[in-house]
């Protein structure tokens, strides 16, 4: 029907427009007219797929009309101006606004020209991560929890860990209708080696410029793991005093150290100083097994070490231990 021109008129619009729940969004729609082409626009129409009637119309003489006047507004179209910009602003976005919209120009002599735009209604989630404090259970339990609250669409949560383990992720409706809260637990068998280490929760969402990383420092409560250091198997008579150290790893921290021997209380040449045991010089050989007993809130554990002070060739004036 239209006469031949240098090029057809084109309706320009993005295929998809994101908008945030509760906010306003502009659906952009423009008529592009090639240089030598003439066109005259009499009506701009917006309609939604699957709904009867049009939601917004701008008429050359009647001006704008809206199905929901408080929520819709033509951004640029004005009476008495060329109707080339049909962009429509929507206020107070709702979940149910998500869908396909058609922007249509009624033109002469080309006829009607339209384009479809998909409106995505997003909700930016709030993200938190927290440690799940655990004890040595001997079986897999959650050690960290990552929650992405009120996202639309649901956020995607992944974990990064060198400790092994596996995620357990679930979804529940968010506070606002149409939003989703995603909860992800990091599950592993607790051990003392895990305590104090970190895992990272990575939350991805369309509304984020880049993924959000939340680091969780793990807490595993365990009774003391005890060892005694300071003895090198080369202690001799007439050497300087030496020190044994009771090395304890525990969570919570040790509350007490108790030194003894397999024979009972400490001999006179051994003096307990908290985690350390001072061994004074002796004048005759000894063969004693020392016990360090460490206590924390979860219990007590001990370590034993047999010390021999031998007759021998102590030529250098060093102590019984190199400590």
């Amino acid at each position: 029907w239209p006469p031949p021109g240098t090029g057809d008129i084109i309706v320009q619009a993005p295929t998809q427009v994101p908008g945030f729940l509760g906010d306003s969004v502009t659906l952009p729609c423009y008529l592009q007219v090639p240089g030598m082409e003439e066109t005259h626009v009499s009506q701009l129409t917006w309609s939604r797929h699957g709904e009867s009637g049009s939601m917004a119309v701008f008429h050359q003489t009647q001006g704008p009309n809206y199905s929901e006047p408080k929520r819709l507004e033509f951004v640029a179209a004005r009476l008495g101006t060329e109707l080339r910009d049909a962009s429509l602003r929507m206020f107070g976005l709702r979940v149910e606004d998500e869908g396909n919209y058609t922007c249509l120009f009624v033109t002469f002599p080309q006829g009607s020209r339209s384009v479809d735009i998909w409106l995505r209604v997003l909700a930016k989630p709030q993200n938190t991560a927290e440690v799940q404090k655990v004890q040595l259970t001997g079986k897999p339990v959650p050690v960290a929890r990552c929650v992405s609250t009120g996202g639309r669409p649901p956020a995607h949560i992944t974990w990064h860990s060198d400790l092994g383990g596996m995620p357990n992720t679930s979804q529940a409706p968010g506070f606002l209708s149409g939003t989703v809260t995603v909860t992800s637990l990091w599950i592993l068998v607790p051990s003392s080696q895990v305590d104090g280490k970190s895992v990272t929760c990575k939350v991805e969402h369309e509304s984020f410029e880049k993924p959000q990383l939340l680091t969780v420092n793990l807490t595993v409560y365990y009774p003391p793991e005890v060892s005694i250091s300071g003895y090198d198997n080369n202690w001799y008579l007439s050497q300087n005093e030496a020190t044994l150290t009771c090395d304890a790893r525990s969570n919570p921290e040790p509350t007490g150290y108790n030194w003894s021997t397999t024979m009972g209380p400490l001999p006179p040449f051994a003096v307990a100083q908290g985690a350390q045991l001072l061994i004074r010089p002796v004048d005759k050989p000894i063969n004693t097994t020392f016990i360090c007993n460490v206590t924390n809130a979860l219990g007590a554990r001990q370590a034993e070490l047999t010390v021999q002070v031998k007759e021998g060739p102590p030529s250098e004036p060093s102590g019984m231990s190199s400590n």
Partner: antibody
Amino acid sequence: EVQLVQSGSELKKPGASVKISCKTSGYTFTEYTMHWVRQPHGKGLEWIGGIHPNQGETSYNQRFKGRVTLTVDKSTSTAYMELSSLRSEDTAVYYCARWTGDFDYWGQGTLVTVSS
Amino acid sequence: DIVMTQSPSAMSASVGDRVTITCKASQNVGTNVAWYQQKPGQPPKALIYSASYRYSGVPDRFTGSGSGTDFTLTISSLQAEDLAEYFCQQYESYPYTFGQGTKLEIK
């Protein structure tokens, strides 16, 4: 007030041509497309074509196979429709109508009778 | 061409009645439909554009609805002055086409 005033009735013989005028007032002539619609007596409406006064762009109903010519005179804000090779079935009331997608203002109509 | 089929072609109703005229398009025309009222001896008068929007000055007893292929003009409470013929028209694509009309008589 927008007004579209058409020329008077015409009686034509088959094979002849007729040219109807539509003089407008009350609005800017060059801002609106002018269309032509006809209505045989007691029958429905039939779109003939339209013209935009600015550059003279036109669109015609192919049914009229080149028998119709639409023109404008911007100096007098008048639109014209010429229909040639008239036949008896062209007998109808011819309307000019201002186009706003739909037709918001119409002329009073011009009766064209084609009879031998 | 898009065919606009109107029904009924004629009807009579009493003052105060609710009157419904339908128009079916042979293909999807979106909401590019207008309704006109034509009184005897007069040119048509635009009532509705874009399927559901009333022209200023048109009484609110006239309501248009529909999209796609099915359209309705409703007169909620018929008045004596509504005696006329009513036409639908599509302006989605060329050639623009009209329904054959519905002649409304007052009982």
